[in-house]
């Protein structure tokens, strides 16, 4: 009896794993083995496919074959017993085009109200993605274990932190990779679950801001309690895309180690030009807070986007505010040759209710004030360029008293 060729050969490529699956064409014939040959583009001869010779099952793995993943190859299969079937040729394919991105590896770290997610490619030093390793982006689905309501987060990098979670709550998530340059979407990782911790008695520092004073950076933050020590760490922002890089390590700012105030001052030359992430942690000697939310810090912009200086002319029912160029060390004005928008915040000195005005002009009227009342004003500048969406820190507050009634003219 003539052996029939196997049919329906499927090639599955996930990362560097090459798997072949096929159907037996005749289930009634026992003790049949199967063998594959392959042929590279531009070659006439067929070569035995190692790992896929004399296979008794209907699946084989040819991952050990060192192929050029961008080169088209052709496969053929036949069945063998005493005699052999005719060859069945599989449509030619390019491994890279056919390959799927495998499930990434995921490591989770729990805080009380946040989860840190570390993601790395499932296949280390993959041949398939050797040229694209740094182009991976990831997306994830996260849900509270108790509710199952899913939230999707797209376009994240190898390290991502999800904030505003509840303490002592189990969250589950799964992650998949994408190579947008090749229109490839990967396979989801297994589901990983982690329980957030009990609430930390020490909250993380908040409202971190960087400003420039003389030749120094001044880093300020808010904290709930007194008598604390703080440490500040920095990281090159580009490394968030590539934690596999051995440079990926948060480092101490020496002048901001164990500081006892809610600010620290360090020389501008600590940082070369670039974009950095900064984070702050508090300690009371016994306990330590979790890390603050990270802020992005661009030395180029920080150096030139200083808070505005302004003068106030007080009337009975309004202030006229005249905004000037910020002053550098030595009291010389900074020339800023790019358009700015000004955010002016004012409030009655005896109240916390703030009002806001946003203006492009450098002379601004603050209307509807009460006579003989002390008002405080602070201002900051924003760049109007979409690509350069940056803000200065707020200027120091200036407080003035409005004039008695009927002086508005």
């Amino acid at each position: 009896k003539n052996l029939k060729s196997p049919q329906k050969v499927e090639v599955d490529i996930i990362d560097d794993n090459f798997i072949l699956r096929w159907n037996r064409s005749d289930e009634s014939v026992g003790n049949v083995t199967f063998s594959f040959d392959y042929q590279k583009t531009g070659m006439d001869n067929w070569i035995k496919l190692s790992g896929c010779q004399n296979i008794t099952s209907t699946k084989c793995n040819f991952s050990s074959l060192k192929l050029n993943v961008y080169e088209e190859i052709k496969l053929r299969i036949r069945a063998e017993k005493e005699n052999t079937s005719s060859w069945y040729e599989v449509d030619s394919f390019t491994p890279f085009r056919k390959a799927q991105i495998g499930p990434p590896e995921v490591h989770l770290e729990a805080e009380d109200k946040a989860i840190v997610i570390h993601i790395s490619p499932g296949t280390k030093d993959s041949v398939m993605w050797a040229l694209d390793g740094l182009s991976f982006t990831y997306s994830l689905v996260i849900w509270k274990n108790s509710s199952g309501v899913e939230e999707r987060i797209e376009n994240i990098y190898s390290r991502h932190k999800i904030y505003k979670l509840s303490p002592e709550t189990t969250y589950c998530l799964k992650v998949k990779a994408a190579l947008l340059t090749s229109w490839k979407i990967g396979v989801y990782s297994p589901v990983h679950c982690i329980k957030t911790t009990v609430e930390n008695e020490l909250p993380p520092p908040e409202n971190i801001e960087v400003s420039v004073q003389n030749q120094n950076y001044v880093l300020k933050w808010d904290y709930t309690y007194a008598n604390m020590t703080f440490q500040v760490q920095w990281l090159h922002a580009f490394l968030k895309r590539n934690p596999g890089n051995h440079l990926y390590k948060w480092k101490q700012i020496p002048d901001c180690e164990n500081v006892k105030t809610t600010q620290c001052v360090f020389p501008q030359n600590v940082f070369q030009k670039g974009i950095y992430l900064l984070r702050v942690q508090a300690s009371d000697g016994n306990n330590t807070s979790f890390w603050s939310e990270e802020i992005k810090f661009d030395t180029e912009i920080q150096a030139f986007l200083l808070p505005p200086v302004f003068n106030i002319r007080s009337l009975s029912d309004s202030f006229h505010i005249y905004i000037g160029a910020p002053k550098q060390s030595g009291n010389t004005p900074v020339i800023q040759d790019y358009p700015l928008i000004y955010e002016i915040i004012f409030w009655e000195n005896t109240s916390n209710a703030e009002r806001k005005i946003i203006e492009k002009k450098t002379d601004v009227t603050v209307p509807n004030l009460k006579p003989l009342t002390v008002y405080c004003v602070k201002a900051r500048a924003h760049t109007m360029d979409e690509k350069l969406n940056k803000s200065s820190v707020f200027s120091d507050a200036v407080c003035e008293k409005t004039k008695p009634g009927n002086t508005s003219k």
Partner: antibody
Amino acid sequence: QVQLVQSGAEVKKPGASVKVSCKASGYTFTSYWMNWVRQAPGQGLEWIGKIDPSDSETHFNQKFRDRVTLTVDKSTSTVYMELSSLRSEDTAVYYCARGGRISFDYDAALDYWGQGTLVTVSS
Amino acid sequence: DIQMTQSPSSLSASVGDRVTITCKSSEVIYNRLAWYQQKPGKAPKLLISGATTLESGVPSRFSGSGSGKDYTLTISSLQPEDFATYYCQQYWNKPFTFGQGTKLEIK
């Protein structure tokens, strides 16, 4: 697979120094902290310190800070722990143990351990 | 330094028994707790990290629970190879500290 192989047993006199090595293989050496832990005969475990093999940053248990030196040889993926001014109470098995990834935000458990090096201090 | 107090310090049990070992920290350690098993003349072996996460290759009869300052290692059905000394360790604050150990012996 991950392996940490330590140097052999040492006998030292009080006041001397000992240098124990730990050769790592099976993972990216510079991506993980390397810790040192000791265990006196019949006693519990005591953390000595840790080193980042990529840049040699170290953290120590204050108890050992003045007497211990941790160093790295990246070319051979080896970490060294040197303990000076030895006294009889330093007689212990010294272990190297891999810690968390350096890129993690927080410290991690010690997932792989060397086989241990017995250091005996005796006059 | 954070103190880790393990109890009991020794325990006799039989194959098939359910065994619980507890570990208390002097400060909150936010689930940064590991459990290790050590057999005579051998290095410790990591069983559980993050208070509850079972390391790969560790039998599912081992489980960890707890939060804040109180943590527990449970062995649901003791096997002959489980007789050993068990240590807890906190890695929230440096210096990392270990419990004094619990010796699990055959009854």
